[in-house]
Interface confidence: low
């Protein structure tokens, strides 16, 4: 039995971040779960992990670089972007393990979401006069 | 005396509602989350809700999802278990408990009530 994850097709990060909610067909509520983001087709860069049991408060890191936030709900967690590079143009794919009560379960493969980073665009300083010539 | 005491159970009719409180003395509930359980005779112990105390964010089982609904009133130190649409298979003694997060696995709480018994019956 598998869980299955819905996301957005795309998102597009135009300062640089993003939030990116895996919506899941599973109650997370009174569980131990791993909840995790993939980047690329082949899901080789794990992005950011939200893990929760009662024992501690709820963790959200990331091993690869990414700055990072997680947010909890009954049946979704929202992964937070920040300070994304232009370069980091992706599919990213939500992944989702439930540890405890048993049995153990996770999901689907999902459709995953292309994230599309826009590049900041520096607006030009206003043009003040400079010191006069004679 | 640091206690947690729950109220407003009852008998009730399938279809009915109820409003269980979960009240503390000699502490603050504002700086915890706070879970309602349920325990059914011959059946284990299960989370039904759960409130938050950062944010306020509320957990619901699937069992009692869009029926119940938890709130919370820090100025009357007291959390609100609303219970709407009840069923026979509600029936059970209910329990509040603080924790420091409203997910997980461990059930390590701080302060237990004593329990308020639900029954749903024609």
């Known amino acids: 039995n598998k869980i299955l994850v819905k996301q957005s097709p795309m998102l597009v990060a135009y300062d640089n971040a993003v939030n990116l909610s895996c919506k899941y067909s599973y109650n997370l509520f009174s569980r131990e779960f791993r909840a995790s983001l993939h980047k690329g087709l082949d899901s080789a860069v794990e992005v950011c992990v939200v893990y929760g049991n009662y024992s501690q408060q709820l963790q959200v890191y990331s091993k690869t670089g990414f700055n990072c936030d997680g947010k909890l709900g009954n049946e979704s967690v929202t992964f937070y972007l920040q300070n994304l590079y232009v370069n980091q143009t992706d599919i990213y794919f939500c992944k989702i393990e439930v540890m405890y009560p048993p049995p153990y379960l996770d999901n689907e493969k999902s459709n995953g979401t292309i994230i599309h980073v826009k590049g900041k665009h520096l607006c030009p300083s206003p043009l003040f006069p400079g010191p006069s010539k004679p | 005396e640091v206690q947690l005491v729950e109220s407003g159970g009852g008998l009730v009719q399938p279809g009915g509602s109820l409003r269980l409180s979960c009240a503390a003395s000699g502490f603050t509930l504002d700086a915890y989350a706070i879970h309602w359980f349920r325990q059914a005779p011959g059946k284990e112990r299960e989370g039904v809700s759960c409130i938050s105390s950062s944010d306020g964010s509320t957990y619901y089982a699937n069992s009692v999802k869009g029926r119940f609904t938890i709130s919370r009133d820090n100025a009357k130190n007291a959390v609100y278990l609303q219970m709407n649409s009840l069923k026979p298979e509600d029936t059970a003694v209910y329990y509040c408990?603080?924790?420091?997060?409203?997910?997980?696995?461990?059930?390590?709480?701080?302060?237990w009530g004593q329990g308020t018994q639900v029954t749903v019956s024609s």
């Open positions: 408990a603080t924790a420091k997060r409203c997910w997980g696995l461990s059930y390590e709480y701080d302060y």
